[in-house]
Interface confidence: low
Amino acid sequence: EEELQVIQPDKSISVAAGESATLHCTVTSLIPVGPIQWFRGAGPGRELIYNQKEGHFPRVTTVSDLTKRNNMDFSIRISNITPADAGTYYCVKFRKGSPDDVEFKSGAGTELSVRAKPSAPVVSGPAARATPQHTVSFTCESHGFSPRDITLKWFKNGNELSDFQTNVDPAGDSVSYSIHSTAKVVLTREDVHSQVICEVAHVTLQGDPLRGTANLSETIRVPPTLEVTQQPVRAENQVNVTCQVRKFYPQRLQLTWLENGNVSRTETASTLTENKDGTYNWMSWLLVNVSAHRDDVKLTCQVEHDGQPAVSKSHDLKVSAHPKEQGSNTAPGPALASAAPL
């Protein structure tokens, strides 16, 4: 009888991650007696994938019934393929030996390549907020794809960006790859509602790219503009002074009124009005009892927005411009009346 040959008919196969891979192997003789084993790789460091003697390996099933000695088909099916399974698989015939089985003959090998989808892109922005006109960096990461070829694009509100750098790692052969890209974006005051999108296209996605997004609302800080105005007299000896806080984002804002440099009242913004661009407006006012003042009053509206250094706007209130009621100042009330925002 002719010497046994181990035949692996497929030089290479390609399988999508999550599917099963069938590795074909037949022998031409039942002699010598001995088990078939499957290995990934060659040489001393090869990895045992299946051993006829040892029975069930969790992810490996045999195509034929290997409990029968007359079986000549030693093909195996590996389930739930992952990129880590990529490599060259060898079907190896062993001859019974003592104390160890002796390798008799190996097949030529079948190279298994795995097509793996990239993970959903994750876009992250800067750790701290930035103000309009500043340039901020966004990163996009996707992992676990194979083969290595991949395309990444950046968009801001649907418009493709060009200022970005992309790396695919590792540079050499690997079971799977990762992509990392950094894009630079110039913020504008209108960006509260803007989105930055990272789009990844890969052969495994069949023309339906994956997208990751970041909302610029998480990144931008639009500082407020302040305007302090004196309203017409609402009652005898009372003046209404308002502080308009306009076009700010995010909402977190604290306002302090000062009278000649002394704190009169501090309040936290509530009942904000939202502008179409996503920024907010707020107004606070004071009722000033001018009869309680002999001299002019400097009123200051001081605003601390989103933990940033305070900005302020002042208004000089001319006391002399208001007539005083005779005999009404013998027991004056508080100089500044507390007022709720509109």
Epitope: V33, K53, E54, G55, H56, P58, T67, R69, K96, D101
Partner: antibody
Amino acid sequence: EVQLVESGGGLVQPGGSLRLSCAASGFTFSSFDMHWVRQPTGKGLEWVSTIGIAGDTYFPGSVKGRFTISRENAKNSLYLQMNSLRAGDTAVYYCARGGNWDDALDIWGQGTMVTVSS
Amino acid sequence: DIQMTQSPSSLSASVGDRVTITCRASQDINNYLAWFQQKPGKAPKSLIYTASSLQSGVPSKFSGSGSGTDFTLTISSLQPEDFATYYCQQYNTYPYTFGQGTKLEIK
């Protein structure tokens, strides 16, 4: 020296449970399939269970659903958990190593006696 | 299940004799056959595996042969320590099964 030592046998009432242990030494335990074989007094040998190195298990119909086999490679130990015991399970229980490429039983322990009686 | 039938059930022989014990399987077991020796109160000892392969440390006076369904164990020259009960076992298909045993006694 390659050695297998069983323990855990004893007298148990019908319907009861018993857990047998087999301590292995002198070889790389995790690299071998392991077996339990029993022998009623004055009678022949009966295969009871096999556990492969990958944890795959096999039983004859006579004990399936009542016996479980397990192994703890880190402790070089083999176990046989026997539940719903019957008088017909009375026997000497041996553990054995599947030591050859084709899983022939090459090394046997000295055995432990299990008696099921009320 | 595969049935294993040994013959004879018992055998009387003298020291120096050559004896043969046979084992028949109810279906082809593809040479997955082992032979064991057991002495009273002792554990079985492996003699032969894969029908004809001698287990390490077993004297060459023991030999096995056969294929398919019919197998034999031969002891070429009996010694006093060889008087025991001998079992065959198939391990081709679960459940593994043993023959009923052959008791070899001194004549």
